[in-house]
Amino acid sequence: HSDGIFTDSYSRYRKQMAVKKYLAAVLGKRYKQRVKNK
């Protein structure tokens, strides 16, 4: 555990947030498409 705390960095957090945002946008788009196709 020599450097255990440093894995929770702001840069990693920002990347995670960007991925979440992208996935939400993609899933939202798919959902809208499905509704439109019904």
Epitope: H1, D3, G4, I5, F6, T7, D8, Y10, Y13
Partner: antibody, heavy 112, light 110 residues
């Protein structure tokens, strides 16, 4: 987000436990620090718990505070035997050595 | 424990001016860059400004600039605005998983 609770007026020597509740992320992937600020003074780092539950403390805080994870969303700070010098606002903050999400703080007053 | 020394303890400058705050560490920070800066106004929580010595946090204006590595760091605020009046703190992360804060610098904008 992060929110602290449990701050109140206590008499010297009475143990007190503060709780930090997080939302929007899990403690299984976060390091959480406790930081305090005495009235009119600067910020003082107390200690940290990493994503695996390992704890690290400032040398002055080792015998006086205990940090523990009590659930996937809560971290406690136990003040074992508070003195009047421990009167401060206690903050919980996320991040390993760079504190990027802060709570509003909870005020602890130690007085007889 | 490592000690972070901030200078000056207080600085005053006019709107539109520039202030420089220094932060010296008694030992090298983790990876020579694990130094962050915070802004705190009375009655509020600290606000995260700069991470890993020189990177701006989201939403922080480019008027804020961090520099340095190892044991010597600087925060420069240019084109000062009234809203920049606050106390600024540096914080370091170190090998062995310990952290520390500087003593703070009060910035007064005239």
């Amino acid at each position: 987000s992060v929110e602290e609770s449990g701050g109140r007026l206590v008499t010297p020597g009475t143990p007190l436990t503060l709780t930090c509740t997080v939302s929007g992320f899990s403690l299984s992937s976060a390091a959480m620090s406790w930081v305090r600020q005495a009235p009119g003074k600067g910020l003082e780092w107390i200690g940290i718990i990493d994503d695996s539950g390992n704890t690290y403390y400032a040398s002055w805080a080792k015998a006086r505070f205990t940090i523990s994870k009590t659930s996937s969303t809560t971290v406690d700070l136990k003040m074992t035997s508070p003195t009047t010098e421990d009167t401060a606002t206690y903050f919980c903050a996320r991040g390993g050595g760079e504190f990027f999400i802060w709570g509003p703080g909870t005020l602890v007053t130690v007085s007889s | 424990d490592p000690v972070l020394t901030q200078t000056p303890s207080s600085v005053s400058a006019a709107v539109g001016g520039t202030v420089t705050i220094n932060c010296q560490s008694s030992q090298s920070v983790y990876n020579n860059k694990w130094l962050s800066w915070y802004q705190q106004k009375p009655g509020q929580s600290p606000k995260f400004l700069i991470y890993q010595a020189s990177n701006l946090a989201s939403g922080v204006p480019s008027r804020f600039k961090g520099s340095g590595s190892g044991t010597q760091f600087t925060l420069t605020i240019s084109d000062l605005e009234c809203d920049d009046g606050a106390t600024y703190y540096c914080a370091g992360g170190y090998r062995g998983n310990v952290c520390g804060f500087g003593g703070g610098t009060e910035v007064v904008v005239k």
